[in-house]
């Protein structure tokens, strides 16, 4: 149903990393434009990305208001140049998105190893606490601020010349691993939310090896 020269959006997909959240859809518009609405289950609809020819809409500003809420979006299709026109049922064509709960579903961004410092046979490895777009009291919260103990990090490390990998986990952003003196090690980190059923792990951080500029060495 609807006007003959508009088609409903389809393949509505949430793309979200560290709470930066964009709704994408198809098709590329031909003689039509789109408006997006977003709502919590119990809230009112709020319109965004008015009469756009894009096939994506940044909804970050809305979802960061409460990342533990469940959100639903819908995409309306209008004829280009005649946005007052409606479908046969008296309203424009629209399609609903899947539900989206940012806290449970946003992808964990690729972590970065901020620094490593060797003191004797121990190496302190620090993973950067990435900033998110979630605000509290006018400051942006870090990933740790938002997830608290739900977020852990896993460190994979190995002797530079070896293939055997070891792992450690931490509830902070720091590791303190045992190494052999005079031996170079490489490592990468991964963010993990063990309690999740989807999107539990981030991609791996870039590999860092001892002897590179991020490291410090003390006897």
């Amino acid at each position: 149903s609807g006007t003959t020269n508009t088609v409903a959006a389809y393949n509505l997909t949430w793309k979200s990393t560290n709470f930066k959240t964009i709704l994408e859809w198809e098709p590329k518009p031909v003689n039509q434009v789109y408006t997006v609405q977003i709502s919590t289950k119990s809230g009112d609809w709020k319109s965004k990305c008015f009469y756009t020819t894009d096939t994506e809409c940044d909804l970050t500003d809305e979802i960061v208001k409460d990342v533990k809420q469940t959100y639903l979006a819908r995409v309306f299709s209008y004829p280009a140049g005649n946005v007052e026109s409606t479908g046969s049922a008296g309203e424009p064509l629209y399609e609903n998105s899947p539900e989206f709960t940012p806290y449970l579903e946003t992808n964990l961004g690729q972590p970065t190893i901020q620094s490593f410092e060797q003191v004797g046979t121990k190496v302190n490895v620090t993973v950067e606490d990435e900033r998110t777009l979630v605000r509290r009291n006018n400051t942006f919260l870090s990933l740790r601020d938002v997830f608290g103990k739900d977020l852990i990090y896993t460190l994979y490390y190995w002797k530079d010349s070896s293939t055997g990998r070891k792992t450690n986990t931490t509830h902070t952003n720091e590791f303190l691993i045992d190494v052999e003196k005079g031996v170079s090690y490489c490592f990468f980190a991964q963010a993990v939310i063990p309690s999740r059923t989807v999107n539990r792990k981030s991609t791996d951080s870039p590999v860092e090896c001892m002897g590179q500029e991020k490291g410090e060495f003390r006897e």
């Epitope: 509290r136 601020d145 608290g148 739900d150 450690n168 509830h171 902070t172 590791f175």
Partner: antibody, heavy 125, light 108 residues
């Protein structure tokens, strides 16, 4: 040295809301620890209620989650517990505690290492 | 939730004797998350052991912890008068964090 002190009414009427505050002294509430509430029913064991990070991130015991709110006030170095719709079964000693990171096996894990003295709350009309 | 069962409920011993307290979990607990606490009457619990086997700063070496998986043990090698108290194991790996029911170590 960090010290914790619970405060709040010792008597609450059934169906009302229990409100307690824990004041942190000798350290900052924003220094990377978590802050917990635990209770102990008379002559019984310990029950974890929930915890909060300075940012406001919380975790609750699912058995109490529908009635519990834990909040933090970094400007006052305090965190608080609210437990709604109380009954006689909520009569207990309520403790606040610091959950601090300790090195273990290559990483850091959290343990409740500093506790308040506890405050007795009786639910009765 | 993970249920921690402590045994025995009460242990009657004399000063100088060895105390062995057991904590059994309903499912496997990562040692990293297992702690032991001591509580005396009218006082708050005190952290003794974390990571199943590491003594907290200031805790005498007569206290030791061991175990993995579902079976953990707290041992007091020679009981001192101040050791008579209730001891709780706790897991902090899975929400809700849970405590065992406690073992009371009393003077025989």
């Amino acid at each position: 040295q960090v010290q914790l002190q619970e405060s709040g009414p010792g008597l609450v009427k059934p169906s009302q809301t229990l409100s307690l505050t824990c004041t942190v002294s000798g350290g900052s509430i924003s220094s990377g620890q978590y802050w917990s509430w635990i209770r102990q029913h008379p002559g019984k064991g310990l029950e974890w209620i929930g915890e909060i990070y300075y940012s406001g991130s919380t975790r609750y015991n699912p058995s109490l989650k529908s009635r519990v709110t834990i909040s933090v006030d970094t400007s006052k170095n305090q965190f608080s517990l609210k437990l709604s719709s109380v009954t006689a079964a909520d009569t207990a000693v309520y403790y606040c505690a610091r959950d601090a990171p300790y090195y273990y096996g290559g990483g850091y894990y959290y343990y409740m290492d500093v506790w308040g003295k506890g405050t007795t709350v009786t639910v009765s009309s | 939730e993970i249920v921690l069962t402590q045994s025995p409920g009460t242990l009657s011993l004399s000063p100088g004797e060895r105390a062995t307290l057991s904590c059994r979990a309903s499912e496997s607990v990562d040692s990293s998350y297992l702690a032991w606490y001591q509580q005396k009457p009218g006082q708050a619990p005190r952290l003794l052991i974390y990571g199943a086997s590491t003594r907290q700063t200031g805790i005498p070496d007569r206290f030791s912890g061991s175990g993995s998986g579902t079976d953990f043990t707290l041992t007091i090698s020679r009981l001192e008068p101040e050791d008579f108290a209730v001891y709780y194991c706790q897991q902090a790996g899975v929400v809700p964090y849970t405590f065992g029911g406690g073992t009371k170590v009393e003077i025989k």
